[in-house]
C-alpha cells in the first residue's frame, strides 16, 4: 500500500489488478467499428478527464525519484472514473446488457484505488463534472466516450505498475 510519507505500494498486486482493469475496460467497450471523430456532444463529455502527462512523474526516472506524484495522479483518475461508472450515466436507461462487465470494472477501480490509498490517508481527488444527461441516447454516447478514455488511462497505469513491479519492488 502507498503510505503517507512515501513508502512503496504493493507493486505486484497493483500490476495484476491494473492488468485486470485493462481487460475489463476493453471488454466493456470493444472497438466495434469506430466512434465518430466529431460528435456534437463532445462539449458535454468532459474535457477534464484525467490524463497521465509528462509532468506527472510516471516516467521511469520520475518513478525512481518519487513514485508518490505518479501514484497520486493514478489514484485521482481511478476515483474519477469510479464515480462516473457509479453515476446515472451508467445506472440510468438504457440498462446495461446482462453480461456487461461495467459492474466488475467499477469494483476493480475501487479496489485498485484502495490499494493505493490506505484508510486514514486522503489524497486530493479531482472534481467530477456534473453531467446529467436527460435522454437515454445521451447517456449511451457518454458511456462509450467515458469507456474509451478509461481504456487509455488504465493502459498507461498498467504500464506504470508493470515497470514498478519489475524494477521498484523490494
Amino acid at each position: 500500500r502507498a503510505v503517507p510519507g512515501g513508502s512503496s505500494p504493493a507493486w505486484t498486486q497493483c500490476q495484476q489488478l491494473s492488468q485486470k482493469l485493462c481487460t475489463l475496460a476493453w471488454s466493456a467497450h470493444p472497438l466495434v467499428g469506430h466512434m465518430d471523430l466529431r460528435e456534437e456532444g463532445d462539449e458535454e463529455t468532459t474535457n477534464d478527464v484525467p490524463h497521465i502527462q509528462c509532468g506527472d512523474g510516471c516516467d521511469p526516472q520520475g518513478l525512481r525519484d518519487n513514485s508518490q506524484f505518479c501514484l497520486q495522479r493514478i489514484h485521482q483518475g481511478l476515483i474519477f472514473y469510479e464515480k462516473l461508472l457509479g453515476s446515472d450515466i451508467f445506472t440510468g436507461e438504457p440498462s446495461l446488457l446482462p453480461d456487461s462487465p461495467v459492474g466488475q470494472l467499477h469494483a476493480s477501480l475501487l479496489g485498485l484505488s484502495q490499494l493505493l490509498q490506505p484508510e486514514g490517508h486522503h489524497w486530493e481527488t479531482q472534481q467530477i463534472p456534473s453531467l446529467s444527461p436527460s435522454q437515454p441516447w445521451q447517456r449511451l454516447l457518454l458511456r462509450f466516450k467515458i469507456l474509451r478514455s478509461l481504456q487509455a488511462f488504465v493502459a498507461v497505469a498498467a504500464r506504470v505498475f508493470a515497470h514498478g513491479a519489475a524494477t521498484l519492488s523490494p
Partner: antibody, heavy 117, light 112 residues
Framework: EVQLQQSGPELVKTGASVNISCKAS????????IQWVKQSRGKSLEWIGY????????RYNQKFKGKATFTVDTSSRTAYMQFSSLTSEDSAVYFC??????????WGQGTSVTVSS | NVVMTQTPLTLSVTIGQPASISCKSS???????????LNWLLQRPGQSPKRLIY???KLDSGVPDRFTGSGSGTDFTLKISRVEAEDLGLYYC?????????FGSGTKLEIK
C-alpha cells in the same frame, strides 16, 4: 461516412404488414439510437418512436402503439420497423434517422409504402 | 402533445435577398437539463430531410453561415441572410424536448 440505407418501395394490400429495414454504416452502431419518422404525401413529418441499437429498448408515440414494432440486429447493423394491419392512412414515406447527442443527425433515403385495396 | 406552428407556409424569395421563417411551440421547449431542443431541417425536392440547425442556433457541419437560428422558450426563427438557388425546399422546425417529438407543418421556400 455515416450512411443509413433503407429498403426499397413497397406496394401492399390493406390489412397486410410491411417490414422496412435501415442498414447503418460508417459509425459505431451500438452507441446510437435509431428514430423512425412518417411523412404522409403532401403532409408534414410525424415521429413514430425510437429503438436503442445497444439493448433494443424502444419507445413509441402513443398514436403508433400496436401499429409499429421496432427491432434491431446488431450483427448486420440493421434496424427494422414492422407496420401491421395496414390501411390507406399508412400510405407514406417512412424514414429512419440516427439520433445524435442533441438531435437526429443523419437520415435514410426513405421507404415509400403504398397500401392498395 | 406540443404543437409546432410554422409561418409562413410558402415563402417566395429572390436570390440574394434575405428570408425568415417563424416557429412557435405551444409550450416552452426549455428542458430540465437547461438546453432547448429546437431543431431545423431542410428537405430538398425528392430528397430525405437534412439537419441544418440543432439546439436553436448551432449549425450542422457543412451548413453555410448565411443560416442562423435564434429564439428561446416558445418563439424561434430561422433566417437566411442571402438566399441561394440550393436553398429551395421544405423547411421544418421540430422539438425534441417533450415526447412525442413533434414537427412544424413546414415552410416551402421557392425562388422568385
Amino acid at each position: 461516412e455515416v450512411q443509413l440505407q433503407q429498403s426499397g418501395p413497397e406496394l401492399v394490400k390493406t390489412g397486410a404488414s410491411v417490414n422496412i429495414s435501415c442498414k447503418a454504416s460508417g459509425y459505431s452502431f451500438t452507441a446510437y439510437y435509431i428514430q423512425w419518422v412518417k411523412q404522409s404525401r403532401g403532409k408534414s413529418l410525424e415521429w413514430i418512436g425510437y429503438i436503442s441499437c445497444y439493448n433494443g429498448a424502444t419507445r413509441y408515440n402513443q398514436k403508433f402503439k400496436g401499429k409499429a414494432t421496432f427491432t434491431v440486429d446488431t450483427s448486420s447493423r440493421t434496424a427494422y420497423m414492422q407496420f401491421s394491419s395496414l390501411t390507406s392512412e399508412d400510405s407514406a414515406v417512412y424514414f429512419c434517422a440516427r439520433q445524435g447527442f442533441y438531435a437526429m443527425d443523419y437520415w435514410g433515403q426513405g421507404t415509400s409504402v403504398t397500401v392498395s385495396s | 402533445n406540443v404543437v409546432m406552428t410554422q409561418t409562413p407556409l410558402t415563402l417566395s424569395v429572390t436570390i440574394g435577398q434575405p428570408a425568415s421563417i417563424s416557429c412557435k411551440s405551444s409550450q416552452s421547449l426549455l428542458d430540465s437539463d437547461g438546453k432547448t431542443y429546437l431543431n431545423w431541417l431542410l428537405q430538398r425536392p425528392g430528397q430525405s430531410p437534412k439537419r441544418l440547425i440543432y439546439l436553436v442556433s448551432k449549425l450542422d457541419s457543412g451548413v453555410p453561415d448565411r443560416f442562423t437560428g435564434s429564439g428561446s422558450g416558445t418563439d424561434f426563427t430561422l433566417k437566411i441572410s442571402r438566399v441561394e438557388a440550393e436553398d429551395l425546399g421544405l423547411y421544418y422546425c421540430w422539438q425534441g424536448t417533450h415526447f412525442p417529438f413533434t414537427f412544424g407543418s413546414g415552410t416551402k421556400l421557392e425562388i422568385k
